[in-house]
Every structure is written in structure tokens, then in C-alpha cells.
């Protein structure tokens, strides 16, 4: 590339016209501030290409860099570029204007930076000061670039004198950013929503001041973009948050939402994903099974638990024999439904010191505007058995009878046993079971009655002994699921003068 005049620095008069020419073996173009100003391009007979840039009515604002470059660098060995710097001293222009990117200088490490205050005249003396400070800072100045050095987090201005007036530049703000490795967390207000409701997700990064967020989500794949909002959660260390909000969700919005965070300074990145489910309508579903018959033990506390899934949050009611239950002031009943995860619930009915009257038909109903579920079971109150009576009698028939009466829930079993050697029973000799043989020695008759009001069974059993020739220890044992009880009586022969 050949540039005329060759530069590399030119000082031109204000209001004048000046022509710059660039030529090369391939198409060439002049560039100014990353743009191509109007210019005349030509191709000579010898095959060389040229571009002529005519600068007319020059002002101080024409001060700056001009580049000549190949129009299409493909196929060329070098991406050659010629730089020319033009000054147009102009007393009406103090410092050249800066855009916002130049006024705020962000750093991530201690490094040399340039405060780009530039004047139109290379002869001017320019000094650097802290903003609102008078003392000039000892930093080298390049008229084409500005002040270069290592700067603290402060604001700075440049000063020069044009004629008899002092001119200040805009203030330049130097700020050191915090960067570190990236750790991302993603959460959603709800991971399950009904169609028409909103999806709101938050992606949070801690400890970095400069990050870019990128979300991928089902809607994006179909070209329907949603603009996330980024803000500071504003705790120390820095918490930065990006919020993705999708109003009026559709079924197609179900799927994986991924937040990718990059930090360009050190090229760190991290991403996290979360699944969102959009349902057509709400639901309530029982989890696990609860048997239709449940048990509680008299005077003990019992908690009945139902686990279910629901969205949106349901109302939960408990009923006993079709009457609504509530927490009792006496503390006999406690109801609680707790959210163990976003859509999973545990509802508990606690009966404190269970009473017989609390047996009955229980129903839990969970419902909202879209769905409902109910679960019913019978609650049986188990009562430990008690032997209420054990008596012996001598009917005229000559046989001897022993009667045992007891109660309990569930229905008690009765076991009769006897021991003939009083000295060694029951420690050394096991008692003999009675009534389960066809021997004529003994006969057994048992009757069972269910008492509705007390909700328990009564067992009455009569043991008939044919001939008792020596004292006999007879034992009645009642047993059910929650306990057992035993009583004992000594049966003596008719001929003996005593009985116990």
C-alpha cells in the first residue's frame, strides 16, 4: 500500500481542503472511525487500484486516525493497513469529544491504560489532573492517544490552554472490577405451573461484577424470544441475578431451562438447568396406599398420615362419620397439612390419648378448583384384653365347672390350661392345655358378644371338668393383638374340705 502524502502525521489548516491518496495491487479503501467516508475508487491501466479521499472545509473534529486498507483482504498474503494521523488545530474545539465507552474505563487487573483526551493541535501543552484537582499528575502524554499509565480508581480530567482560556476535558472514570470463578444457581418460583400462569426463573451469580447471562428454554427453540431482566441482588460479595419471566405459559413451555453465565475477562463460564412442567389443569394425586382398616390403641396417641401430590395448593379437610373435624380446643385432635416439597403434601390427623368413641369412618378430602381426591378408612380402637371374672362352681351333676369372662378389641382368644402338681407348677412343669382334645375329662363352651357402644368383644368361656381327684390349678388366658391377661383358680375334689 502506498499513501500520499506519506505522513505518518499531518498538520492541516482549519477550513482548508486536503486530498489523501492510497494505492495498491488490490482494491483499497479509506477508513475513519471504523466507517468508510465518501471517496473515489479507481483502477489504473497497469492494474493498480487507488482511492482518493478529499477532506473539505476541515475543522478540528476532523482530527484523528485515518486508515488505508485492502477492500477485500481475502487471498492476500498480509492484511496490510497504513495509518495516518491528521491534526487540524482549531481554537473552537477544545478536547475531541469522547463517547461513553471512552469516559468510563473499567479494569480487572493492575495494567497500563490510556485516558484518551486528545486535542486538535500537537503544539498544545496538556496536563492531567484528578477531577477538581489543580496539581498536574506526572503521566506521559501522546497527542495522538492521550495519557498512558497505571491509574488508581479515581476520576480524572485533562486541561489545556487555548489562547488565553483554560479548557477542561470531560471527566474520565477509572474503576477496577471484581472478577472470579463463576458459580451459578438457578431456581424457579414454581417448577409446576398451569397453562396461563407465569413462569419465573432466577439465575444468580456470586462474586463477579462483569457477567453475561444467556438463557435457553423451549420457547427460544421455536424462535419466540423472551427478554430477561438483569439486576443486582446487591449483597457483598456481588450477587447478580438474571430473571426470565414468561407470562401466560403454554403446554409447549414445559422442558429444560438453562442459564449459562460467562465472564469474558478470564473466560470463565458455568451453567445450571432446571425443569419446568406446564400442566393443562391442576391435579391432586394420592401417593402410596392407606389400608381401608386402620387401628389405634386405647389411651395411646395415634397419627394417621396421608401423602399426596397437588398443584395448585389444595384445601384439605378431614371428616369423621361425615362430620367435619377441626383442631379441638381440648387438644384431643390435631390436624396438620404440610408442604414437604413444591407439590408434595403430608396431611396428618393426630388423635391424642385415643378414646373408644373415636372409632369410626374417617375421610380425608384434598381439593382445589381443578381436581379433588378423597381417601376413607375405618378406624378401629384396639383395647387390651382384661379377664374380668374367673370362678369355679359345683353343679349337682357332680362335675365341676370353671367360668372365665373377659373383654378386648380385637376379639380375644381364650386359652385354658391346668397343672396337677401344685408344687412344681408352673415353673418346672408346663401346664397342660385343656379343651382342645376330645377327651371326656373336660368340655369347653365359649360364647362371644360384640358390645356396640363400648366397641369391644366380650368372651365368656365355661370349662367342665368331669372328675377332679386332687387339687388342680386352672388358668384362663385371654390374648389379642394388643395384649394378654391371665387369672388362675385352684379346683379341689368334692371330698376335700377346702377350696381356694
Amino acid at each position: 500500500l502506498v499513501v500520499t502524502p506519506p505522513g505518518p502525521e499531518l498538520v492541516l489548516n482549519v477550513s482548508s481542503t486536503f486530498v489523501l491518496t492510497c494505492s495498491g495491487s488490490a482494491p483499497v479503501v479509506w477508513e475513519r472511525m471504523s466507517q468508510e467516508p465518501p471517496q473515489e475508487m479507481a483502477k489504473a491501466q497497469d492494474g493498480t487500484f487507488s482511492s482518493v479521499l478529499t477532506l473539505t472545509n476541515l475543522t478540528g473534529l476532523d482530527t484523528g486516525e485515518y486508515f488505508c486498507t485492502h477492500n477485500d483482504s481475502r487471498g492476500l498474503e498480509t492484511d496490510e493497513r497504513k495509518r495516518l494521523y491528521i491534526f487540524v488545530p482549531d481554537p473552537t474545539v477544545g478536547f475531541l469529544p469522547n463517547d461513553a465507552e471512552e469516559l468510563f474505563i473499567f479494569l480487572t487487573e493492575i495494567t497500563e491504560i490510556t485516558i484518551p483526551c486528545r486535542v486538535t493541535d500537537p503544539q498544545l501543552v496538556v496536563t492531567l489532573h484528578e477531577k477538581k484537582g489543580d496539581v498536574a499528575l506526572p503521566v506521559p502524554y501522546d497527542h495522538q492517544r492521550g495519557f498512558s499509565g497505571i491509574f488508581e480508581d479515581r476520576s480524572y480530567i485533562c486541561k489545556t490552554t487555548i489562547g488565553d482560556r483554560e479548557v477542561d476535558s470531560d471527566a474520565y472514570y477509572v474503576y477496577r472490577l471484581q472478577v472470579s470463578s463463576i458459580n451459578v444457581s438457578v431456581n424457579a418460583v414454581q417448577t409446576v405451573v398451569r397453562q396461563g400462569e407465569n413462569i419465573t426463573l432466577m439465575c444468580i451469580v456470586i462474586g463477579n461484577e462483569v457477567v453475561n447471562f444467556e438463557w435457553t428454554y423451549p420457547r427460544k427453540e421455536s424462535g419466540r424470544l423472551v427478554e430477561p431482566v438483569t439486576d443486582f441482588l446487591l449483597d457483598m460479595p456481588y450477587h447478580i441475578r438474571s430473571i426470565l419471566h414468561i407470562p401466560s405459559a403454554e403446554l409447549e413451555d414445559s422442558g429444560t431451562y438453562t442459564c449459562n453465565v460467562t465472564e469474558s475477562v478470564n473466560d470463565h463460564q458455568d451453567e445450571k438447568a432446571i425443569n419446568i412442567t406446564v400442566v393443562e389443569s391442576g391435579y391432586v394425586r394420592l401417593l402410596g396406599e392407606v389400608g381401608t382398616l386402620q387401628f389405634a390403641e386405647l389411651h395411646r396417641s395415634r397419627t394417621l398420615q396421608v401423602v399426596f401430590e397437588a398443584y395448585p395448593p389444595p384445601t384439605v379437610l378431614w371428616f369423621k362419620d361425615n362430620r367435619t373435624l377441626g383442631d379441638s380446643s381440648a387438644g384431643e385432635i390435631a390436624l396438620s397439612t404440610r408442604n414437604v416439597s413444591e407439590t408434595r403434601y403430608v396431611s396428618e390427623l393426630t388423635l391424642v390419648r385415643v378414646k373408644v368413641a373415636e372409632a369410626g369412618h374417617y375421610t380425608m378430602r384434598a381439593f382445589h378448583e381443578d381436581a379433588e381426591v378423597q381417601l376413607s378408612f375405618q378406624l378401629q380402637i384396639n383395647v387390651p384384653v382384661r379377664v374380668l371374672e374367673l370362678s369355679e362352681s359345683h353343679p349337682d351333676s357332680g362335675e365341676q365347672t370353671v367360668r372365665c369372662r373377659g373383654r378386648g378389641m380385637p376379639q380375644p382368644n381364650i386359652i385354658w390350661s391346668a397343672c396337677r402338681d401344685l408344687k412344681r407348677c408352673p415353673r418346672e412343669l408346663p401346664p397342660t392345655l385343656l379343651g382342645n382334645s376330645s377327651e371326656e375329662e373336660s368340655q369347653l363352651e365359649t360364647n362371644v358378644t360384640y358390645w356396640e357402644e363400648e366397641q369391644e368383644f366380650e368372651v365368656v368361656s365355661t370349662l367342665r371338668l368331669q372328675h377332679v381327684d386332687r387339687p388342680l390349678s386352672v388358668r384362663c388366658t385371654l390374648r389379642n393383638a394388643v395384649g394378654q391377661d391371665t387369672q388362675e383358680v385352684i379346683v379341689v375334689p368334692h371330698s376335700l374340705p377346702f377350696k381356694v
Partner: antibody, heavy 127, light 107 residues
């Protein structure tokens, strides 16, 4: 040298309109966010609105949304506040201020305060 | 909107005193807080930005501290020129809110 001068204030009836102007000098106006802040005499400061360098982003306090509009003309180094549907509670001194909001760093803005203020212009809404 | 609460509303002090003004945000604002000084009939003047950074030209007797929700402006030795009203101001997601102000007057 760096200066902001407000104008356009005055007495207006409730429901009326007014247009405030702010003339900037001594700095590259087109490189800065700008804000309007108001102050009821004897009371505290209330931020009203702000806008970015090219006017593509504008933000307002809730109480003025839909009634007050911020705008700018960079070639004229001027900031404006169009006030419609004025109410008695809009009576205040209105200040124009330079808002130090750097270009986005990553996905968000930094903030270094309002470093240059005008002297204010009084708006009185009364019948 | 984020609310800013300053205390006290009025503070009486003498030249040479150490003066402390506090500002509390209704939610965390990191260190996005500025302090301003205003004298009667004048426009506010920026003193401190980003909670603790002193604006150029502001005397070093002014200092700011705090982050999250609780912030403090301290004047280490009150001077005659410092009798004024002081305001804190937060920045969060493009909006700004000022505190109600603290008037520092002569005891």
C-alpha cells in the same frame, strides 16, 4: 465550565401542560445519561425520570408514568421534560442532573451518582 | 420501590464535632448508594458515590461506609461550611430513590 441550565417553569392550572428544557454545556452531552429530579419547597428530593445517551431507554418514578415524558436532542445539547395532566402535587423545583451511568458492563449498569446539577426551575400547579 | 430511611431527621452539632448520619434501605442495594449535600436555595452536590468513593474535590473529612441495607455518612470534624441538609440516594435497576434528608444545624 460544565453547566446545566433549566428553563420553562411557571404557573399552570391543574390538568395543564408545560415543557421544561435543560441546556448543557462544557461536556460531551451525547455521552451521558441524564435525569430530572424535583423538590417540593422545604421538602426532600424526588427522582422523576432518566434516559440513556441515545434516548432508547427511559425510566420514570411510578407517580408520573403516563403524564411526564423525558426526551433529548443531542445536537442541541438539550434535555426536555414534557409535563401533561399536571396536578397540584407536581408543584416543585425541577432540577436537571447529569447521571453517571457507564455503558453496560456485561448485562447490567454501574452507577456513580449525579455529579452535575442545574440551578432548578420552579413549576407551580394551582388554580 | 426501594425505600430509603435516614436518621436522624435533624442533628444539632458544633464546629469540630464528629457527625454521623445513617441511611437504611428497605432491601439490599449492595454498595449502590450516593450521598449529596444541599444548602438552602442551591442545587444538591454529589459527595460520595458507590457507598464509600469520595467525589473529586470533596474534602477528605467526608467519608461513607456500609453495604447491603445499612449505610453511614461521617464528617470527621464538622466545619462551618458543612451546615446543610444531606441526602442518601440508591440506584437499583435503573430507578433511583432518595432518603428524606438529614438537616445538620448549629447547636
Amino acid at each position: 465550565q460544565v453547566q446545566l441550565v433549566e428553563s420553562g417553569g411557571g404557573l399552570v392550572q391543574p390538568g395543564g401542560s408545560l415543557r421544561l428544557s435543560c441546556a448543557a454545556s462544557g461536556f460531551t452531552f451525547s455521552s451521558y445519561w441524564m435525569s430530572w429530579v424535583r423538590q417540593v419547597p422545604g421538602k426532600g428530593l424526588e427522582w422523576v425520570a432518566n434516559m440513556n445517551q441515545d434516548g432508547t431507554e427511559k425510566y420514570y418514578v411510578d407517580s408520573v408514568k403516563g403524564r411526564l415524558t423525558i426526551s433529548r436532542e443531542n445536537v442541541k445539547n438539550s434535555l426536555y421534560l414534557q409535563m401533561n395532566g399536571l396536578r397540584a402535587e407536581d408543584t416543585a423545583v425541577y432540577y436537571c442532573a447529569r447521571d453517571l451511568v457507564p455503558p453496560r458492563q456485561g448485562d447490567y449498569y454501574y452507577y456513580f451518582g449525579m455529579d452535575v446539577w442545574g440551578h432548578g426551575t420552579m413549576v407551580t400547579v394551582s388554580s | 420501590a426501594i425505600q430509603m430511611t435516614q436518621s436522624p431527621s435533624t442533628l444539632s452539632a458544633s464546629v469540630g464535632d464528629i457527625v454521623t448520619i445513617t441511611c437504611r434501605a428497605s432491601q439490599s442495594i449492595s454498595d449502590w448508594l450516593a450521598w449529596y449535600q444541599q444548602k438552602p436555595g442551591k442545587a444538591p452536590k454529589l459527595l460520595i458515590f458507590k457507598a464509600s468513593s469520595l467525589e473529586s474535590g470533596v474534602p477528605s473529612r467526608f467519608s461513607g461506609s456500609g453495604s447491603g441495607t445499612d449505610f453511614t455518612l461521617t464528617i470527621s470534624s464538622l466545619q462551618p461550611d458543612d451546615f446543610a441538609t444531606y441526602y442518601c440516594q440508591q440506584y437499583n435497576s435503573y430507578s433511583r430513590t432518595f432518603g428524606q434528608g438529614t438537616k445538620v444545624d448549629i447547636k
